[in-house]
């Protein structure tokens, strides 16, 4: 990850126990940009600083995810810690002037997709996985990565060997494995985007 | 705030390709997938296809593709569809269109451009 | 492809009415369906995304409901801005299909 998701990471390591509380319950009532969702309150509570910073960048990407940060910082009474995050974020690409948003920045990474931010429930919890193979074969999946999958003993080890193929994929082909998520395990998939 | 701000009416020949734009503002190009919309006069929508211009890949409808391209020119935050060998057929508005919520479960479109009416006439 | 069939294509309704439409879906698209308002010479408007969820902004008149292969769209309290098309939408499988549309007069 980029520069913004280690700064986030640096102010949110250096909140006491009790300041680490209190973010987390600002952050359930902070203003949010339009098109943002709030990150559910049950995960929220029991992140520690390394799961938060994660799961900031992954909802908010990591220009909007560090410029709120700043903001809660700033709510709960720590300017300074804010002022060092927003810098840290800056430095290189010259901050705007006091007074003047910056204008939106690509992350450094795009956000996490669906299937990314739920990697761990999905090798945990998808059972239909040769329906998703055969959704997926030919599209996204050759014939020898099809066997290697198909191969291994349980549905997790299999979720797990398609998982490691993923980082090659571009968007549309995680697209594409959502899809097929939708189309057979549809409980499953609004059971992760409430969680 | 989101906006997404597309070119002009075009008026164009039979046979003749056009590159409808839509530039995006209040938020990053790469950050969500741009599709786009096609409305026939009297008719419903139709969906022709996406592109996520964070890795340039992009998913097409079959019964557009070899006649819409789709790009982005991420330094001015622009998205691009090209139509090519252009028949009457093609006349309709056409939206570009952007999912509400990052990360989503499905695409939901929130945002929209305004329209670009294409009219293709000799 | 999966096929959407929207009815009625029309209806004319009076003002403080509630009204119904609904949207058929060829095969099983479960809660992925989203709803549309158009009003005459605009772009569409988003009111309902996953059957039953209220886009922010939308007016509570606007109610969704169904799974699976049938969703109903109710607009209770008919108003004069009511008026114009609504199309739905799944958005389950690609391509993504849109009903052929409902449009909405007030008599």
């Known amino acids: 990850m980029g520069r913004a998701r280690d700064a986030i990471l640096d102010a949110l390591e250096n909140l006491t126990a009790e300041e680490l509380k209190k973010f987390k319950l600002k952050l359930l009532s902070v203003p949010l940009r339009e098109g943002y969702g709030r990150i559910p309150r049950g995960a929220l509570l029991s992140m520690d600083a390394l799961d938060l910073t994660d799961k900031l960048v992954s909802f908010y990407l990591e220009t909007y995810g560090a410029e709120l940060t700043a903001n809660v910082l700033r709510d709960m009474g720590l300017q300074e810690m804010a002022g060092q995050l927003q810098a840290a974020t800056h430095q290189g690409s010259g901050a705007a002037p006091a007074g003047i948003q910056a204008p939106p920045q690509s992350a450094a990474k795009p956000g996490l997709h669906f299937i990314d931010q739920h990697r761990a429930a999905l090798i945990a919890r998808v059972t239909n996985v040769e329906w998703l193979l055969d959704a997926l074969y030919g599209k996204v999946l050759t014939d020898e990565q099809y066997q290697a999958v198909r191969a291994e003993p349980t549905n997790p080890s299999k979720m797990r060997k398609l998982f490691s193929f993923t980082p090659a994929w571009n968007w549309t082909c995680k697209d594409l494995l959502l899809q097929a998520l939708r189309e057979s395990q549809s409980y499953l998939v609004e059971d992760l985007e409430r969680s | 705030q989101v906006q997404l701000q597309q070119s002009d009416a075009e008026l164009v020949k039979p046979g003749a390709s056009v590159k409808i734009s839509c530039k995006v503002s209040g938020y990053a190009l790469t950050d969500h997938s741009i599709h786009w919309m096609k409305q026939r006069p009297e008719q419903g929508l139709a969906w022709i296809g996406y592109?996520?211009?964070?890795?340039?890949?992009?998913n097409y409808n079959d019964k557009f593709k070899g006649k819409a391209t789709l790009t982005a020119d991420i330094s001015s935050s622009t998205a691009y569809m090209q139509l090519n060998s252009l028949t009457s057929e093609d006349s309709a508005v056409y939206f570009c269109?952007?999912?509400?919520?990052?990360?989503?479960?499905?695409?939901?479109?929130?945002?929209w451009g305004q329209g670009t009416t294409l009219t293709v006439s000799s | 492809d999966i096929q959407m069939n929207q009815s009625p294509s029309s209806l004319s309704a009076s003002l403080g009415d509630t009204i119904t439409i609904t949207c058929h879906a060829s095969?099983?698209?479960?809660?992925?369906l989203s709803w549309y308002q158009q009003k005459p010479g605009n772009v569409p408007k988003l009111l309902i995304y996953?059957?039953?969820k209220l886009h922010t902004g939308v007016s509570s008149n606007f109610s969704g409901s169904g799974s699976g292969t049938g969703f109903t769209l109710t607009i209770s309290s008919l108003q004069p801005e009511d008026i114009g098309t609504y199309y739905c939408?799944?958005?389950?499988?690609?391509?993504?299909?849109f009903g052929g549309g409902t449009k909405l007069e007030i008599k």
């Open positions: 592109m996520y211009p964070g890795d340039g890949s992009a």
């Open positions: 095969q099983n698209i479960n809660v992925w």
């Open positions: 996953k059957a039953s």
């Open positions: 269109t952007r999912p509400y919520y990052f990360g989503s479960s499905y695409d939901y479109f929130g945002y």
């Open positions: 939408q799944q958005g389950q499988s690609y391509p993504y299909t």
